[in-house]
Interface confidence: low
């Protein structure tokens, strides 16, 4: 079978890929070679760790490897007729693709001398044990397998691809997805270093609900030994997050404006490069021997140098390369810690924000603070959250429960509130009476009152009709019939302008005048509630239809 699952780790100037698939050593080498690489070398402890990392990545994805011991080809072979040399670390084996006889070795057991056939080396993984940097895979020597005969072959192999340089991963300053396509035809969305000539596809956005933007970049050699994407500034910037998303995509410092905007900056001794993201030393050595972000520092009289890592990195055993320190292991944050290249970032849970005593501390966000309340009306702050409330006459509404919607008390579930006519208003209601009746002091019942005759008046004019708006728009008072036991209106009177005597105990207004000037109103034909004899009128008294309503400052008709 062919090579299936693959994993990739890029570091320094090389990428390592791990593949599962029962191939002979020759088939595995051919597979690596087709994409411009070779079976991997393991020339130092550091390289052994890189290879172990890529194998660990593969094993996390590969469920099919059920064997307790697993073997993966590397590029160490001894040709037929060439004998063992016990005095050499590589015992007479040599690296595919050439290279010097290196001092590092990690043999599984003493090698038997055999010059009859070609011998190949694989990494022996004990899958029953966790892969630890202190327990690197042992080298196992044996026959090189048979092409086209899976049964005689081992579980997989590791390739190595060397490059003239690497680009830093693209910096995302907001939600998005980067997909790198390497020259060796691997796609990945998480590479620590991206090899020269790789392509990057950036899709910005938070998924379906966002219209995603796409950007395309190539890792190019901008100057000798300087590799760059040619992009400027963090990608997928989102003022919604400011510096809180991936440190704004900035290499070192992220400076946030009050409006969610941000800019990258650098620590003293560093300068911001043209990409507006990365920081570089102001005084690098003219031809730096240091790698992986290490800064070259001249010694006294300029005679020697030392490599120094940026904060959050430390030198590896070669003293030339920097490796990231996982500062989160020291639990420096109150809530969440995010390890970033060269540093860490403290994050607070939803409902909390940075603040309080000590670095990385979090304090409750007062969502109800002046000017930032998400609620339409009442807001109560709670630890890590908040909840909204509405004034009387309104109920919570909206998908997120932050809006308030007027309750139409005239059609409410609690049954008729008024004995006769009911007028819904914004956040409240009034009761009214049919012509010839006036509202009792309780604001609910109707009593027989003076009758005034006036010219008949129809429904409101066309421009006064409209839909009820949300709670921020004044609403017209609307008359609804309160219904009898059968649930049907008993009669529908017409309306006329009121002409009550001056000593009437209540005020009245035609329906049309109840709406604030210029605001939308809803016209409903008022009708009679067929109430009991004690509670209100049984029949209309005459043809006049002026409607009396309780004043808004009355208490009985209000909630």
């Amino acid at each position: 079978t062919g090579a299936d699952t693959e994993a990739v780790v890029c570091v320094g100037t090389a990428c390592y890929t791990a593949h599962s698939g029962k191939l002979s050593a020759a088939e595995a080498q051919n597979h690596c070679n087709q994409n411009g690489g070779n079976l991997a070398t393991v020339k130092s402890k550091e390289e052994a760790q890189h290879v172990q990392r890529v194998l660990a990545q593969l094993l996390r994805r590969e469920a099919a490897l059920t064997a307790r011991m697993s073997k993966f080809w590397i590029g160490l072979q001894r040709e037929k007729g060439k004998c063992l040399d016990p005095s050499l670390p590589l015992k007479g084996f040599s690296w595919v693709g050439g290279g010097e006889d290196t001092p590092y070795s990690n043999w599984h057991k003493e090698l038997r001398n055999s010059c009859i056939s070609k011998r190949c080396v694989s990494l022996l993984l004990d899958l029953s044990q966790p892969l630890l940097p202190s327990r690197l895979p042992k080298w196992s020597e044996g026959p090189c397998g048979s092409p086209g005969s899976p049964g005689s072959n081992i579980e997989g192999f590791v390739c190595k691809f060397s490059f003239k340089g690497m680009c830093r991963p693209l910096a995302l300053g907001g939600p998005g997805q980067v997909t790198y396509t390497t020259p060796f035809q691997t796609t990945s969305s998480s590479l620590e270093a991206v090899p020269f000539a790789s392509a990057a596809n950036v899709a910005c956005g938070e998924g379906d609900k966002d219209e995603t933007q796409s950007h395309y970049f190539l890792c190019k050699e901008k100057a000798p030994d300087v590799f760059d994407w040619g992009s400027s500034g963090p990608l997928c910037v989102s003022p919604k997050y400011g510096c809180n998303f991936n440190n704004g995509g900035c290499h070192q410092d992220c400076f946030e404006g009050g409006d969610g905007s941000f800019l990258c900056g650098c620590r003293p001794g560093f300068r911001l490069l043209d990409d507006l993201v990365t920081c570089a030393s102001r005084n690098p050595c003219s031809s730096s021997p240091c790698r992986g972000g290490a800064t070259c520092v001249l010694g006294p009289h300029g005679k020697n140098y030392t490599c120094r890592c940026p904060q959050g990195y430390q030198l590896d055993s070669s003293q030339l390369d920097c490796v990231d320190v996982d500062e989160c292991q020291d639990s420096p944050c109150a809530q969440e810690c995010v390890n970033t290249p060269g540093g860490f970032r403290c994050e607070c849970w939803v409902g909390y924000e940075p603040g309080g005593p000590g670095e990385g501390a979090c304090q409750d966000v007062d969502e109800c603070a002046l000017g930032r309340s998400p609620c339409a009306q009442g807001c109560t702050n709670t630890d890590g959250s908040f909840h909204c409330s509405c004034e009387e006459g309104y109920v919570l509404a909206g998908e997120d429960g932050t809006q308030c919607q007027d309750v139409d008390e005239c059609v409410g579930p609690g049954g008729p509130l008024c004995d006769s006519l009911c007028f819904n208003t914004q956040g409240s209601f009034h009761c009214g009476c049919l012509p010839g009746w006036v509202l009792a002091p309780n604001g609910v019942s109707c009593t027989m009152g003076p009758v005034s005759l006036g010219p008949p008046s129809g429904p409101p004019d066309e421009e006064d009709k409209g839909e009820k708006e949300g709670s921020t728009v004044p609403r017209a008072a609307t008359a609804s019939p309160t219904r009898g036991p059968e649930g049907t209106p008993k009669a529908t009177p017409t309306t006329s302008r009121p002409s009550l005597s001056s000593d009437a105990p209540i005020t009245s207004a035609p329906l049309k005048m109840l709406a604030p000037s210029g605001s939308p109103g809803v016209w409903r034909e008022p009708s009679i509630h067929h109430a009991t004899a004690a509670s209100g009128p049984q029949e209309p008294a005459g043809g006049d239809s002026s409607v009396a309503t309780q004043n808004n400052d009355g208490t009985d008709g209000q909630k």
């Epitope: 933007q213 500034g233 910037v237 400076f255 009050g258 800019l263 900056g265 300068r271």
Partner: antibody
């Protein structure tokens, strides 16, 4: 309210020097990058210089590099632009701006006229 | 340097009209483009950030679109207070540059 007030403009001879000031109020000055932007008599806008919030990074338009210096005094909430070796092309209204996503706030501007 | 080309140079319109102003970049600037309005005898003010994101206190009739090299500012149903100069500006790379502007005038 955010308020930026420029001063120090005026008539200056060719090759002369001038120092512009910008008094900032209504926001935490030390939290923001600040810039100078100028507008020529032909109404063309041109970015001149930017300074980081802590003052340790500065950025200049190539044509003013070496002649202009942007600086800030966070204690005084003041931004400065020291201009020397002035040439006729430097004649413009100079605006002090607060940097955010774009130039989010602008002062009213101060006119600098370079004459022969 | 990134050159921003605005077109047209002048646009004569009547209140109530809707218009589109164009800004083209000499190379891709992602969405790092901002629009400003400058009324006569006033300082410029930010209208749209990051090509399409609205600014609080700016009327909703102003909107922006585009990415890469081509950008558009649209004004829906122009009001008399909208006449003046409109500039685009990129913040993709140093030096920060502006377009030459489009003058919106009364027909």
């Amino acid at each position: 309210d955010v308020n930026l007030v420029e001063s120090g403009g005026g008539l200056v001879k060719l090759g002369g020097s001038l120092k512009l000031s910008c008094a900032a109020s209504g926001f935490t000055f030390s939290n923001y990058y600040m810039s100078w932007v100028r507008q020529s008599p032909e109404k063309r806008l041109e970015w001149v210089a930017t300074i980081s919030n802590n003052g340790d990074s500065t950025y200049y338009l190539d044509t003013v590099k070496g002649r202009f210096t942007i600086s800030r005094d966070s204690a005084e909430n003041t931004l400065y632009l020291q201009m020397s070796s002035l040439i006729s092309e430097d004649t413009a209204v100079y605006y002090c701006t607060r940097v955010g996503t774009g130039f989010t706030y602008w002062g009213q501007g101060t006119l600098v006229t370079v004459s022969a | 340097d990134i050159v921003l080309t605005q077109s047209p140079a002048t646009l004569s319109v009547t209140p109530g009209d809707s218009v589109s102003l164009s800004c083209r970049a000499s190379q891709s600037i992602n969405n790092y483009l901002h629009w400003y309005q400058q009324r006569s005898h006033e300082s410029p003010r930010l209208l749209i950030k990051f090509a399409s994101q609205s600014i609080s206190d700016i009327p909703s009739r102003f909107s922006g679109s585009g990415s890469g090299t081509d950008f558009t500012l649209s004004i829906n149903s122009i009001e008399t207070e909208d006449f003046g100069m409109y500039f685009c500006q990129q913040s993709n790379s140093w030096p920060l540059t502006f377009g030459a502007g489009t003058k919106l005038e009364l027909k």
